[in-house]
Amino acid sequence: HNTTVFQGVAGQSLQVSCPYDSMKHWGRRKAWCRQLGEKGPCQRVVSTHNLWLLSFLRRWNGSTAITDDTLGGTLTITLRNLQPHDAGLYQCQSLHGSEADTLRKVLVEVLADPLDHRDAGDLWFPGESESFEDAHVEHSISRSLLEGEIPFPPTS
């Protein structure tokens, strides 16, 4: 698997997307886990709703949310109030029984400032950046929530 790099700014939100073949993974729950070492386990952070038909409902674990568009084939993970310790290597997984298929390997980078980026001197902007080796970068900037603001519209 190639590794996709997602960069966000500390204190803001970062949205990670993992596309997949909706037919191949039909009926399967998804999960987001953190790789603890080269050969270590992938520690589960959050998984989609226990009922696959309700996978579109956003589920939270702490400041991490997951939601699955099972028809469009896109798993979306939101890391709210991004902090330096959120930086790490993660996986989007498709679950079947006790097994898990890797949909995407994701390297999350937390920048101290929007000016921090790989190509110093250039303006940093959201969107996909140049590739390096087996990884490509997706920059994601989203504003911080104002006090009292509801993070996402309530699901009915």
Epitope: V5, G40, N81, H85, A87, E109, D113, R118, F132
Partner: antibody, heavy 121, light 113 residues
Framework: EVQLQQSGPVLVKPGASVKMSCKAS????????VHWVKQSHGKSLEWIGL????????SYNQRFRVKATLTVDKSSSTAYMEVNSLTSEDSAVYYC??????????????WGQGTLVTVSA | DIVMTQSPSSLSVSAGEKVTMSCKSS????????????LAWYQQKPGQPPKLLIY???TRESGVPDRFTGSGSGTDFTLTISSVQAEDLAVYYC?????????FGGGTKLEIK
Amino acid sequence: EVQLQQSGPVLVKPGASVKMSCKASGYTFTDYYVHWVKQSHGKSLEWIGLINPYTGTTSYNQRFRVKATLTVDKSSSTAYMEVNSLTSEDSAVYYCARSRVYYGSSLFAFWGQGTLVTVSA
Amino acid sequence: DIVMTQSPSSLSVSAGEKVTMSCKSSQSLLNSGNQKNYLAWYQQKPGQPPKLLIYGASTRESGVPDRFTGSGSGTDFTLTISSVQAEDLAVYYCQNDHSYPYTFGGGTKLEIK
């Protein structure tokens, strides 16, 4: 055994620049961030910034953004820090340190022996 | 920036005595998402680089003797050495591992009588 071997002490003139190195061994260089920390004589520690050797992405302490530039050479598993426009305030020991967390920035788990920079006319 | 304040700045004790030193942060180091405190303690012996002792406010790094104990939450933290040994002569620093820029306290210098 994880080791970070830093370049030797330097004496430089005010206004000049210095580039110091930190050669890593005993682990996969691209798996862990490298941090740089300043310690002025008899003083506490100041975090300068970090670099992810896998991507080359850097994050700086705002105080050092125009003062320091961090780079890596993956082929030699070496991290570099260049400090420019040197003044007496830049005289210090500079440490490189490796993060504890896999592909993460947290914690300074392994340290180099330090590079002493003396700025004097 | 998060300001880390350590006290006392120095203390002198006899071998075998118990020692406690304090570290206060200007903002909470408790992550509400996972309920972890992002506070680390380092030991710096004369002429050496710092060494990681404690992380997560209370977890000892591997190889660190169990006489070193970290405690506290939010903004108030403590490092305790249950029975000081001669080799514990050092400066002890606390560090904000929660937010950029990472910041250190001014240090507590431990001297052995």
